[in-house]
């Protein structure tokens, strides 16, 4: 059932067993979600496993803008600027919670969703499989 | 303001720009733990900027456990296993959304919160400041 606030200190729910629909307060302490990570640091450019940041925009999601990292090279950049293919640039992934509008276009009705995002890249030694 | 459902198909909101309090359906899309990729890679060990994962635990937050990456070295690990201090291991940070009960112990009222977490580390060329 839809959660409708009553007189008590807690919002009440029509569903006595479990509130599948809850109230979420979006007064986030730090609400400026679409901050471009390029501004916070230039690691994406200075890394030995540099990455490009792709803007993933979805007006039906909160936050509507998520930045996805895509490694620039298969290998890693050496001091001379050349790429060393004996090493691998790999994305570091993180699972995050987002809100998705549901039904679509409803301004204040959402569904909680977990998504996997690539945050940046790191340079790793490859796993070498020896064939007998 | 509190979002109260009206007669239309969508719950209404007092804030026309962006609702402060929204309805959230908790039937999460990616519910099964088995589909939760817990970063099942050993990049943290194989990286040239390896990191340790530290537990950040808060029982009043979901997720209750978040893993924070702490770079093992100031420098980066070379092919011979030694640390190169002419390069820097730096944390890659990501802002994530978490849910907090508010008021505490109310079963169907939550507050969305943003926290900054270190997801992993990358190896970067240092910024050299030349003194005149």
């Amino acid at each position: 059932g839809i959660a409708i606030p009553r007189n008590s200190g807690c919002p009440n729910s029509e569903d006595k067993n479990f509130p599948r629909t809850v109230m979420v307060n979006l007064n986030i302490h730090n609400r400026n979600t679409s901050t471009n990570p390029k501004r916070s640091s230039d690691y994406y450019n200075r890394s030995t496993s540099p990455w490009n940041l792709h803007r993933n925009e979805d007006p039906e999601r909160y936050p509507s803008v998520i930045w996805e990292a895509k490694c620039r090279h298969l290998g890693c950049v050496k001091a001379d600027g050349n790429v060393d293919y004996h090493m691998n640039s790999v994305p570091i992934q993180q699972e995050i919670l987002v809100l998705r509008r549901e039904p679509r276009h409803c301004p204040n009705s959402f569904r909680l969703e977990k998504i996997l995002v690539s945050v940046g890249c790191t340079c790793v030694t490859p796993i070498v499989h020896h064939v007998a | 303001g509190i979002a109260i459902p009206r007669n239309s198909g969508c719950p209404n909101s007092e804030d026309k720009n962006f609702p402060r309090t929204v309805m959230v359906n908790l039937n999460i899309h990616n519910r099964n733990t088995s589909t939760n990729p817990k970063r099942s890679s050993d990049y943290y060990n194989r990286s040239t900027s390896p990191w340790n994962l530290h537990r950040n635990e808060d029982p009043e937050r979901y997720p209750s456990v978040i893993w924070e990456a702490k770079c093992r070295h100031l420098g980066c690990v070379k092919a011979d296993g030694n640390v190169d201090y002419h390069m820097n291991s730096v944390p890659i940070q990501q802002e994530i959304l978490v849910l907090r009960r508010e008021p505490r112990h109310c079963p169907n009222s939550f507050r969305l919160e943003k926290i900054l977490v270190s997801v992993g580390c990358t190896c970067v060329t240092p910024i050299v400041h030349h003194v005149a």
């Epitope: 909680l112 | 999460i28 088995s34 939760n36 537990r55 997720p63 209750s64």
Partner: antibody, heavy 117, light 106 residues
Framework: QVQLVQSGAEVKKPGSSVKVSCKAS????????ISWVRQAPGQGLEWMGS????????NYAQKFQGRVTITADESTSTAYMELSSLRSEDTAVYYC??????????WGQGTLVTVSS | DIQMTQSPSSVSASVGDRVTITCRAS??????LNWYQQKPGKAPKLLIY???SLQSGVPSRFSGSGSGTDFTLTISSLQPEDFATYYC????????FGQGTKVEIK
């Protein structure tokens, strides 16, 4: 200090159901999951499924899908595990455990369920 | 399901001995590996989480190592209260446990 206290031993007939309870004392469930793990006599540990009481999200091991139901009552800080269509091989000690979704850090004392005709 | 294989299935040791138990995952699980101790008639107790982190209140003689598919639990100097069964458990996927290793008195 979190303590999980489980209901007492049960003797059940094949084909019947059993419902085991797990009460969190010394605090609420908080945002953790509660998992159920069983151990047949002289055997190892087997995860059955979990619930996050805050949200009511459940996740069941494939083996028990359709036969196990995990619920939670936040007002009493109690989780329940119901297993239906019992057979003799379901004779085991059933444990509830607080589950961070990474490890089980607090366990109930266990409930012995015996299935016998 | 990810299969967890422990070895040995049992080990006889004396007080003061160094005991090593290994656990192998059927696929890479990063560091999402935990170790539990269980005594007869009791519930399991978490010793090590995330492959190498010591759970609070657990003596420092217990240590864990490994990453990917191969993991080790080491008891540096066996104490009388350490005679028990030890289980590894992965949580990279739906949780699965190893079959257990019984540490017995020699």
């Amino acid at each position: 200090q979190v303590q999980l206290v489980q209901s007492g031993a049960e003797v059940k007939k094949p084909g019947s159901s059993v419902k085991v309870s797990c009460k969190a004392s010394g605090g609420t469930f908080s945002s953790y999951a509660i998992s159920w793990v069983r151990q047949a006599p002289g055997q190892g540990l087997e995860w059955m499924g979990s619930i996050i009481p805050w949200f009511g999200w459940t996740n069941y091991a494939q083996k028990f899908q359709g036969r196990v139901t995990i619920t939670a009552d936040e007002s009493t800080s109690t989780a329940y595990m119901e297993l239906s269509s019992l057979r003799s091989e379901d004779t085991a000690v059933y444990y509830c455990a607080r589950d961070s979704e990474y490890y089980f850090d607090h366990w109930g004392q266990g409930t012995l369920v015996t299935v016998s005709s | 399901d990810i299969q967890m294989t422990q070895s040995p299935s049992s080990v006889s040791a004396s007080v003061g001995d160094r005991v090593t138990i290994t656990c192998r995952a059927s696929q890479g699980i990063s560091n999402w590996l935990n170790w539990y101790q269980q005594k007869p008639g009791k519930a399991p107790k978490l010793l090590i989480y995330a492959a190498s982190s010591l759970q609070s209140g657990v003596p420092s003689r217990f240590s864990g190592s490994g990453s990917g598919t191969d993991f080790t639990l080491t008891i540096s100097s066996l104490q009388p209260e350490d005679f028990a069964t030890y289980y590894c458990q992965q949580y990279s996927d739906d949780p699965t446990f190893g079959q257990g290793t019984k540490v017995e008195i020699k």
